[in-house]
């Protein structure tokens, strides 16, 4: 709980925000968890704390580890943990999976690729963008604020996109790179009112207390690329991200095209360490597009241990 993974490359700047929510101006103390050693606030240090931010300017592989942040007040102390991993720079062009941020999808109508984590840094435009390590050139590519816009997107535009920018700290410049995959959705086809393939309406899913459980919300929306199509889970009518229970997370599955060519989406709801109170929640699989919204409700029930008779 209150823990967040962060990663970066050696000799680049890395800035990490305290995962524990505070408010601006509150004192935040940072510690290196393994030694309980306080992180200095003086900016002359290579690694220093600046309020809710922990700054590695630049980062070194040896900085990897868990950092504790405590948002302090006389009556409330809020503790969070930042799990930081600094990797060596790759000599070849391949960006390993562990350095990739979340994949984004685009189409002819919508082809924005946001540069991940950039809001944490003091940077100035323009961003540099690379695809599969090649600098992007040509009028089709437009670096706009913190995102890249690709005009007339084609399937060949799919790939790994890296943004590169300079973080400035007290007149010193540090390089930062971040990479994410971009997939392209086909524009041909048609759209239908969403059809939820799973779960069945009012399905009862048996789970074991203390074990992990997965629920898959799967729906189809038509053929070809779909404009505004989504599947998501809600808990008691609240979005998973807003519900705020760290044990319950949703994870986007793969886009699926069945043999009949329908465009379908999956969303997997992962419940870690199922608890009694989870059985009381209402789990709604929602599928929506421009035609409307369809909802299938699932309830959890306790799986009784199998009786063994001699």
């Amino acid at each position: 709980k209150f823990s967040k993974q962060s990663w970066g490359l050696e000799n680049e700047a890395l800035i990490v925000r305290c995962p524990r929510q505070g408010k601006p101006s509150y004192t935040v103390d940072w510690y290196y968890s393994q030694t309980n050693k306080s992180i200095p606030t003086q900016e002359r240090n290579r690694v220093f704390a600046s309020g809710q931010l922990l700054k590695f300017l630049p980062a070194a592989v040896a900085d990897s580890g868990i950092y504790t942040c405590i948002v302090r007040s006389p009556t409330f102390n809020r503790t969070g943990y930042a799990n930081v991993t600094i990797y060596k720079k790759q000599s070849d062009c391949n960006v390993p999976d562990y350095l990739m941020y979340s994949t984004v999808s685009g189409s002819e109508k919508n082809s924005k690729i946001y540069c991940p984590t950039i809001d944490l840094y003091n940077w100035t435009a323009p961003l540099e963008w690379f695809k599969n390590c090649q600098a992007l050139q040509g009028s089709r590519y437009r670096a706009h604020k913190s995102f890249l816009v690709i005009d007339n997107v084609m399937t060949e535009d799919a790939g790994d996109y890296t943004c590169k920018f300079i973080h400035n700290e007290n007149g010193a410049n540090y390089s930062v790179t971040a990479t994410r995959s971009f997939t392209v959705k086909d524009e041909q086809g048609f759209s239908l009112f969403p059809v939820i393939g799973a779960p069945a309406q009012n399905e009862i899913k048996e789970v074991e207390i203390g074990k992990n459980a997965n629920l898959t919300c799967s729906a189809c929306f038509g053929k070809g690329t779909q404009f505004l199509a989504a599947v998501l889970w809600q808990l008691n009518g609240t979005k998973i991200t807003d519900f705020g229970e760290p044990r319950i997370q949703q994870e986007e599955g793969q886009n699926q095209s069945f043999s009949n060519g329908l465009a379908c989406l999956d969303m997997v709801l992962r419940i870690a360490d199922v608890k009694e109170e989870d059985l009381l929640l209402q789990y709604d699989c929602l599928a929506l597009n421009l035609h409307g919204l369809r909802r299938h409700t699932v309830r959890l029930s306790r799986k009784n241990p199998i009786d063994h008779h001699s």
Partner: antibody, heavy 117, light 111 residues
Framework: QVQLQESGPGLVKPSQTLSLTCTVS?????????WNWIRQPPGKGLEWIGY???????TYNPSLKSRVTISRDTSKNQFSLKLSSVTAADTAVYYC??????????WGQGTLVTVSS | DIVLTQSPASLAVSPGQRATITCRAS??????????MHWYQQKPGQPPKLLIY???NLESGVPARFSGSGSGTDFTLTINPVEANDTANYYC?????????FGQGTKVEIK
């Protein structure tokens, strides 16, 4: 956005127990924050009653501690106030509010509870 | 308990003018470089709304016409310039220790 809504009886007889519930939407009460009860007698100022934090730990105003219980129902994302042995002096608008850290950041609309026979 | 005393109890201000409310604590609410004093606005029939936290920090979404200052035991909320819809009761609250307490309120009316 955190939203809070108080509910409960508007009229309680003297010596009985006042019971109110605050339903929270847009955020799980077990994720973080402290969840407060505050009251305001008609035409008067605000009085902090106490809170229950995300972990279930409670802190009460010593002036009311002997009569107050704050609890929660995590399955319904609700927290509750019980105030025993009420008198006419407990007549007030009762608010629930959430605290990110120190200050009361989000408030419910409040519910008027009248203590009268 | 820390007692918070607000003054004046009420004031009437013309639009465009400055309104100043003070809050005095019976003991210091400052420690470790911060002052744990907060200000709220309460309009008739509505719940209070946070305006200022830690004595001088403007809460997100609150107009810059509102400002706070002070440390130790003496704090000030300033509205400059006052607008017609600022008619409300204003409360200070400390979080230096338990129990949290509020001032008795200041009623601001617009002439």
């Amino acid at each position: 956005q955190v939203q809070l809504q108080e509910s409960g009886p508007g009229l309680v007889k003297p010596s009985q127990t006042l019971s109110l519930t605050c339903t929270v939407s847009g955020y799980s009460i077990t994720s973080d924050y402290a969840w407060n009860w505050i009251r305001q007698p008609p035409g008067k100022g605000l009085e902090w009653i106490g809170y229950i934090d995300y972990s279930g730990s409670t802190t009460y105003n010593p002036s009311l501690k002997s009569r107050v219980t704050i609890s929660r129902d995590t399955s319904k994302n609700q927290f509750s106030l019980k105030l025993s042995s009420v008198t006419a002096a407990d007549t007030a608008v009762y608010y629930c509010a959430s605290t990110v850290i120190d200050s009361m950041d989000y408030w419910g609309q409040g519910t008027l509870v009248t203590v009268s026979s | 308990d820390i007692v918070l005393t607000q003054s004046p109890a009420s004031l009437a201000v013309s639009p465009g003018q400055r309104a100043t409310i003070t809050c005095r604590a019976s003991k210091s609410v400052s420690t470790s470089g911060h002052s744990y004093m907060h200000w709220y606005q309460q309009k008739p029939g509505q719940p209070p709304k946070l305006l200022i936290y830690l004595a001088s920090n403007l809460e997100s979404g609150v107009p810059a016409r509102f400002s706070g200052s002070g440390s130790g035991t003496d704090f000030t909320l300033t509205i400059n310039p006052v607008e017609a819809n600022d008619t409300a009761n204003y409360y200070c609250q400390h979080s230096r220790e338990f129990p949290f307490t509020f001032g008795q309120g200041t009623k601001v009316e617009i002439k």
